[in-house]
Amino acid sequence: KESCDVQLYIKRQSEHSILAGDPFELECPVKYCANRPHVTWCKLNGTTCVKLEDRQTSWKEEKNISFFILHFEPVLPNDNGSYRCSANFQSNRIESHSTTLYVTDVKSASERPSKDEMASRFWA
């Protein structure tokens, strides 16, 4: 018999490399039986996880699993870091593994000289 506990399926040490300036959806896969739990996202700041209050979120329902989505529209350099989702149901609370976003700042990357340019400047 399948467990009817709520489960959050974020893989341990999962990560995403993404570009600033483009949209991104961070998904928290949620498995539940009867009532959908209350799910939130937070961002790790040292040992504490700061709840993301003013951010856009939505649910995507699929046949066997649901996804609680944190929307980045767009991704900002400041979004770099680790995130965790947590679910409250009845009197229980569970937390997912953290997932890390590695944000590339495309503007500063395009403005920066390449390694070859840097080397030629250094030796010129």
Epitope: G21, D22, D54, R55, Q56, E73, P74, L76, P77, S110
Partner: antibody, heavy 120, light 106 residues
Framework: QVQLKESGPGLVAPSQSLSITCTVS????????VHWVRQSPGKGLEWLGV???????SYNPAPMSRLSISKDNSKSQVFLKMNSLQTDDTAMYYC??????????????WGQGTSVTVSS | QIVLSQSPAILSASPGEKVTMTCRAS?????MHWYQQKPGSSPKPWIY???NLASGVPARFSGSGSGTSYSLTISRMEAEDAATYYC?????????FGGGTKLEIK
């Protein structure tokens, strides 16, 4: 310097479609997003949607079913298409560049706008 | 959608007078942008992310606020400040604008 210029038909008959082209210079469409905003006397400023640098789009859910935004990176052009126009779609249509800083996103450079009147 | 309500709709101020206009959001937003528009022209960025003045904006302008309440203040009104000011949120799609505050010179 950064510039955006809209070109549209001016007059559109009710139930017809609207096509506007935004031609940009001074920046790349692969680095910056371009938004469409309209301004009408009745509704004020209304954000319609955006073409993101990577080619994805986001739309205002209200007029979304009638809207389509596309682009041609090589020509530095972004296109707005809107179907089934009604008289309340009469407005000034602006294309606007979007830019991010470390911790916020905003629309910085605006085109001069193109006036669209829906009338028979 | 997040509704932005600006007040007052019309504001009349004398040169040198301190001016404050407000923008209230129906739900909490991370920050607020402000745009200035003069008749016949496109909106211009005026204040970014609640309190950062856009390039070329005089230091007599300032912005403040958090959550659902934001404001734009002019320490000393000048004739060139007469315009319509719009607040704008980029926290939740659809990204909405306020109805504007029209600032007139007395």
């Amino acid at each position: 310097q950064v510039q955006l210029k809209e070109s549209g038909p001016g007059l559109v008959a009710p139930s017809q479609s609207l096509s506007i082209t935004c031609t940009v210079s001074g920046f790349s469409l692969t680095t910056y997003g371009v938004h469409w905003v309209r301004q009408s006397p009745g509704k004020g400023l209304e954000w319609l949607g955006v073409m993101w640098p990577g080619g994805r789009t986001s739309y205002n859910p209200a007029p979304m079913s009638r809207l389509s935004i596309s682009k041609d990176n090589s020509k530095s052009q972004v296109f707005l298409k809107m179907n089934s126009l009604q008289t309340d779609d009469t407005a000034m249509y602006y294309c606007v560049r979007g830019d991010y800083e470390y911790d916020y996103y905003a629309m910085d450079y605006w085109g001069q706008g193109t006036s669209v009147t829906v009338s028979s | 959608q997040i509704v932005l309500s600006q007040s007052p709709a019309i504001l009349s101020a004398s040169p040198g007078e301190k001016v404050t206009m407000t923008c209230r959001a129906s739900s909490s937003v991370s920050y607020m942008h402000w745009y200035q528009q003069k008749p016949g022209s496109s909106p211009k960025p005026w204040i970014y992310a609640t309190s950062n003045l856009a390039s070329g904006v005089p230091a007599r302008f300032s912005g403040s606020g958090s959550g659902t309440s934001y404001s734009l203040t002019i320490s000393r009104m000048e004739a060139e400040d007469a315009a319509t000011y719009y607040c704008h949120q980029w926290s939740s799609n659809p990204y909405t604008f306020g109805g504007g505050t029209k600032l007139e010179i007395k």
